[in-house]
Interface confidence: low
């Protein structure tokens, strides 16, 4: 942190404060966090910066800082001020920054702020302000930053803002505002950033944002909006829009038609059920679009003019088909997540040349054709789990040189094409009960993790015979750490000197890794030595029937022989 106070004895430096020249023949004075209950008296007329933050000052007298005509920044944050009288800042002609946050003010000190013509930044946040008088900012012609967040406002002080034409950034967050009326910010033509998050806003006037010609950032997160904020249509320069954590149920057609510059939209944590097909058209700067659980969407959105999208997540809807031209609209797509939909048939994704990750789990897909994923040279991860895939073309994966993760678990596969999959590190085929053939480890030289339908199929990956005993003892689950292992099995090594136990276990772990570098599940075990011999209920029932019949025949023979003799 900053160096401790040196209590420099300069003329005009109050006791215990830290003072230093500011390089312009003026003085910077830091009297923060000293437990002061009143303003220091012997301040130099040449003071340019005065920090009185985090003291116990509860009141200011009129004209408490006489003749500080060079003062540019005054910090009174974190005191106990409940009221600031008229004339408290008289004569501070150069004042640019005034910090009054973290006090106990109940309304904006209108009279005290009059004629601070040079003021550029005013901090009034973290007070108890419930009232902002209509003319309170009228003399603040240079004001650029206004902080009113974390107060007790219940409405937008429309009249008070009329005079702030130079304002660039304002926050009204963390208040109790419930409505924004038409033309609430009508004169704020220079405003670039407006924060309204963490209020109780439930309704917006149709023209509430009119006049905000320069606005680039609008934060409406954490409010009670139950309708899409259509009033944003006039914000032609809007780049960042947040309305997450509200109660919005639908996004209408052409929702962002007036906001062609949007780069980011945050709208998660809303109970969105419906989205108009044209809602996200013509947003050339948009990079990410995420929509989870919009259950009434039945058609894939029309994303004409939103060609720079890099990530599209549209999960938990009822989309049953994708347009054949989906990739023509989205040539820059890198991540596509359409999990938990009703997709049956897939188009060819080959025009989406930049795709790196596709997630299509939990759909109704029944077939993977030869051209579905053809020539996706950047594709690294493909998730097709929990579908109804019974047929995969032998060359479906033959042109995916970057593919390292493939999940086909819980489908209806009876065979599995290996062409082109030699780079895989993760392969999941569990839950395909008809897939009973063995897969050779030689086809997957890079494999680290494989999940198969049956334990015996892991034998090809070096986890059979003695290995399964160790595997079962030491690798009970993916997440069991060596720490758990030490606790569970340290008793096995009582003879081992305790000082060496840690080293021994670490060596043992290395030996284990060398023994089978492929993690295959389910692991073969004493009760699953060769499950394929007794696989399927028909075979099992047949064997049991034979045993029972054999037993009955033996019994009859025994009885027969007994009678005979």
């Amino acid at each position: 942190g900053s160096s401790p106070r040196s209590g420099v004895l300069l003329r005009g430096c109050p006791t215990h404060c830290h003072c230093e020249p500011d390089g312009r023949m003026l003085l910077r004075v830091d009297c923060s966090d000293l437990g002061l209950s009143e303003l220091p008296s012997n301040l130099s007329v040449f003071t340019s910066y005065l920090d009185l933050s985090m003291n116990n000052i509860s009141q200011l007298l009129p004209n408490p800082l006489p003749s500080l005509r060079f003062l540019e920044e005054l910090r009174l944050a974190g005191n106990a001020l409940t009221y600031i009288p008229k004339g408290a800042f008289t004569g501070l002609y150069s004042l640019k920054v005034l910090m009054l946050q973290n006090n106990q003010l109940r309304h904006v000190p209108t009279e005290a702020l009059q004629n601070l013509r040079s003021l550029q930044s005013l901090r009034l946040d973290a007070n108890h302000i419930s009232y902002v008088p209509p003319s309170c900012f009228s003399g603040l012609h240079s004001l650029r930053h206004l902080w009113l967040d974390d107060n007790a406002l219940t409405e937008i002080p429309v009249q008070a803002f009329r005079s702030l034409s130079a304002l660039q950034a304002m926050t009204l967050a963390l208040n109790k505002i419930h409505h924004i009326p038409d033309y609430a910010f009508g004169n704020l033509s220079s405003l670039v950033v407006l924060h309204l998050h963490n209020n109780r806003i439930h309704s917006l006037g149709k023209k509430c944002f009119d006049g905000l010609h320069s606005l680039e950032t609008l934060d409406l997160n954490y409010n009670n909006l139950d309708e899409f904020p259509t009033a944003i249509r006039t914000l032609s320069n809007l780049k960042e829009l947040g309305f997450h954590s509200n109660n919005i149920r639908s996004i209408p057609e052409k929702a962002f038609v007036g906001n062609p510059s949007l780069i980011t939209i945050h709208f998660y944590d809303n109970p969105i059920q419906f989205v108009g097909r044209s809602a996200f058209q013509h947003l050339p700067e948009l990079r990410t679009l995420t929509l989870n659980g919009a259950s009434q969407i039945t058609e894939f959105p029309d994303l004409t003019g939103t060609a720079n999208l890099e990530s599209l997540t549209l999960t938990g809807a009822q989309i049953s088909s994708l347009p054949q031209t989906v990739c023509n609209q989205l040539p820059n797509l890198q991540v596509l997540d359409l999990s938990y939909n009703l997709l049956e048939d897939l188009p060819s994704f080959s025009v989406c040349q930049k795709l790196q990750k596709i997630d299509l789990r939990h759909n109704e897909i029944y077939e993977i054709k030869v051209d579905t994923f053809q020539q996706l040279l950047s594709l690294r991860s493909l998730n097709l789990a929990w579908n109804k895939i019974a047929i995969i073309h032998p060359n479906a994966f033959s042109t995916l040189p970057s593919l390292i993760k493939l999940d086909l678990s819980s489908n209806l596969l009876s065979s599995f094409p290996i062409t082109g999959l030699h780079g895989l590190t993760h392969l999941k085929l569990t839950g395909n009960h008809a897939l009973q053939s063995l897969i050779s480890s030689e086809n997957f030289p890079e494999l680290k993790v494989i999940e198969m339908p049956y334990a015996y199929q892991c034998c090809a990956f070096g986890v059979c015979e003695n290995a399964y005993k160790i595997s079962n003892q030491w690798n009970k689950g993916d997440n069991s750490s060596m720490d758990d292992l030490h606790k569970k099995d340290a008793g096995m090594f009582q003879a081992q000197d305790e000082r060496d136990l840690e080293d021994f276990l670490l060596d043992f772990e290395e030996d284990l890794k060398a023994l089978h570098s492929v993690q295959c599940s389910p692991s073969p075990g004493p009760f699953k030595p060769c499950e394929h011999l007794l696989d399927g209920w028909l075979i099992r029932i047949g064997v049991m029937a034979l045993i029972v019949l054999g037993g009955v025949a033996g019994l009859l023979l025994f009885i027969g022989l007994g009678i005979f003799f």
Partner: antibody, heavy 121, light 112 residues
Framework: QVQLVQSGAEVKKPGSSVKVSCKAS????????IGWVRQAPGQGLEWMGG????????KYAQKFQGRVTITADESTSTAYMELSSLRSEDTAVYYC??????????????WGQGTLVTVSS | DIALTQPASVSGSPGQSITISCTGT?????????VHWYQQHPGKAPKLMIY???NRPSGVSNRFSGSKSGNTASLTISGLQAEDEADYYC???????????FGGGTKLTVLG
């Protein structure tokens, strides 16, 4: 004098989580936001997120969204940063720092001493 | 978020002045005065040298000054001293992402 004292160095395995604490001295903890910044070996500073203790609501860098959780306990003047699904590239010194003017755009005027987190299998 | 652009290294002799630049965009450096500068010696935590563009915290030498023009902020150190040798980082607030961004850092070497 404000002081931020962080918990000690940690060695973690890939896939696990780490929780670093930052205890503030002085009576002004709740009024200020606390940020977390990390620095990988030989690399620059990277902002992870921050929290305003008196509201308990946190803000995270997009890169860490979903993987980092920042909390604060006003009663003990302590902030916490938990990072999950650790990977080797998360090996870094993690700093907590105080936002000097209490809000997120302001500068970090006081810093903790840093906590080295090493992620290694 | 894209990091702010700083020169990787600068150097100067004792007594000289040097300037380190920090270039951003209209949404970070250009919009606000929320540009801050930090000094970091090896193995130590960063130390705030300039905040809000041009203000110095108590205890920081007046040899350090900050300024801004358009989308570029600058840190100037006059009368270079051996103890000024360190890494320097700029930081800004990005009004688009509501996030904080740092520059890549500049290594200052004091010659001789």
């Amino acid at each position: 004098q404000v002081q931020l004292v962080q918990s000690g160095a940690e060695v973690k395995k890939p896939g696990s989580s780490v929780k670093v604490s930052c205890k503030a001295s002085g009576r002004t903890f709740s009024n200020y936001a606390i940020g977390w910044v990390r620095q990988a070996p030989g690399q620059g500073l990277e902002w992870m997120g921050g929290i305003r203790p008196n509201f308990g609501w946190a803000k995270y860098a997009q890169k860490f969204q979903g993987r980092v959780t920042i909390t604060a306990d006003e009663s003990t003047s302590t902030a916490y940063m938990e990072l999950s699904s650790l990977r080797s590239e998360d090996t870094a010194v993690y700093y907590c720092a105080r936002y000097g003017q209490g809000h997120f755009p302001s500068a970090f005027d006081y810093w903790g001493q840093g906590t080295l987190v090493t992620v290694s299998s | 978020d894209i990091a702010l652009t700083q020169p990787a290294s600068v150097s100067g002799s004792p007594g000289q002045s040097i300037t380190i630049s920090c270039t951003g965009t209209n949404s970070d450096v250009g919009t606000y005065n929320y540009v801050h500068w930090y000094q970091q010696h090896p193995g130590k935590a960063p130390k705030l040298m300039i905040y809000d563009g041009s203000n110095r915290p108590s205890g920081v030498s007046n040899r350090f000054s900050g300024s801004k023009s358009g989308n570029t902020a600058s840190l100037t150190i006059s009368g270079l001293q051996a103890e000024d040798e360190a890494d320097y980082y700029c930081q800004a607030y990005d009004s688009h992402s509501f996030n904080i961004v740092f520059g890549g850092g500049t290594k200052l070497t004091v010659l001789g």
